[in-house]
């Protein structure tokens, strides 16, 4: 039985050219996290964090994706094309798979604020 819940940074905005932290947190379960996958809105994989092998950053994102903090992901040198949905998929044992959603809006405006509140999607 899957008892856990995924908390995410929810809907966030960030400035073009800046950086943003994508963060998911799995709570209310003792399940062991074996792998976390980070996907973009078009379902392309940005990065994988595997418990045995570590972080794998996909070649297309190597220059502007940094692991962490924790199991999160830092997306750098933001462009308008980065606007959209991001998904964290937690593969756990014995529970199975948990999935969280974050919506990122990249703004031209210099007053863009990065909202970092945690919320359950």
């Amino acid at each position: 039985m899957m008892t856990g819940t995924i908390e995410t940074t929810g809907n966030i905005s960030a400035k073009k050219g800046g950086s943003v932290i994508l963060q998911c947190h799995l709570s209310s379960t003792m399940a062991q996290v074996t792998q976390v996958n980070w996907e973009q809105h078009d379902h392309s994989l940005l990065a994988i964090r595997n418990a045995e092998l570590g972080w794998h950053i996909y070649p297309a994102f190597k220059d502007r994706v940094a692991p962490g903090p924790g199991l999160g992901l830092t997306l750098q040198s933001l462009t308008m094309n980065d606007t959209g949905e991001y998904f964290c998929t937690y593969h756990t044992y014995p529970d199975g798979t948990y999935r969280g959603r974050i919506f990122l809006e990249v703004l031209e405006s210099s007053v863009a604020e990065h909202s970092a509140r945690f919320q359950i999607p």
């Epitope: 792998q35 595997n50 045995e52 092998l53 570590g54 972080w55 794998h56 692991p67 962490g68």
Partner: antibody, heavy 119, light 107 residues
Amino acid sequence: QVQLVESGGGLVQPGRSLRLSCAASGFTFRDYAMHWVRQAPGKGLEWVSGITWNSGLIGYADSVKGRFTISRDNAKNSLYLQMNSLRAEDTALYYCAKPVPRLRGLDVWGQGTMVTVSS
Amino acid sequence: DIQLTQSPSSVSASVGDRVTITCRASQGISSWLAWYQQKPGKAPKLLIYGASSLQSGVPSRFSGSGSGTDFTLTISSLQPEDFATYYCQQAFYLPWTFGGGTKVEIK
């Protein structure tokens, strides 16, 4: 006791292929990621490739990417390294290694199998 | 890829000496660093994992420290059996990488 035994090494011409095997015993093979590490004569250690317990994630050193393929057969407690388009610089002693669970240090190593690429 | 730079590449020391080997990563790797000892004709032996955790059966004169990009392996009092080559290895990012090695020789 925990043991890893490599085999399949030998003398091969540049451009040819070779398949290395590693037979594991003394531990539950299917529970562990596994790795290949090599050492050229008189040189340092070079990580070659790693594979998760279920083959779900695989990594390669840039020097072998596209030429080498790591695989495993959990039913046979065996790890493999298929080496294609071999080059002189692939000449090395190839070790199979097992990690400390989830801590990523390699705590058990085989004795190694020597691969010599020469015409 | 992460480059690991070990220094010195070799060190001459005497029995009883304190020996320090450093390993610097080209990017932060948290604490995902291991240290190995290798003697001629033998497979490497794991000494330290997680930057500072001593592998079972390894003498307490070996210790590791550091986090992020700078790491240290210390042998508090060198013993005759410690003359060997030492390697650091990162496991934060794929591909994993090793340092170039440090040879500890008899002075």
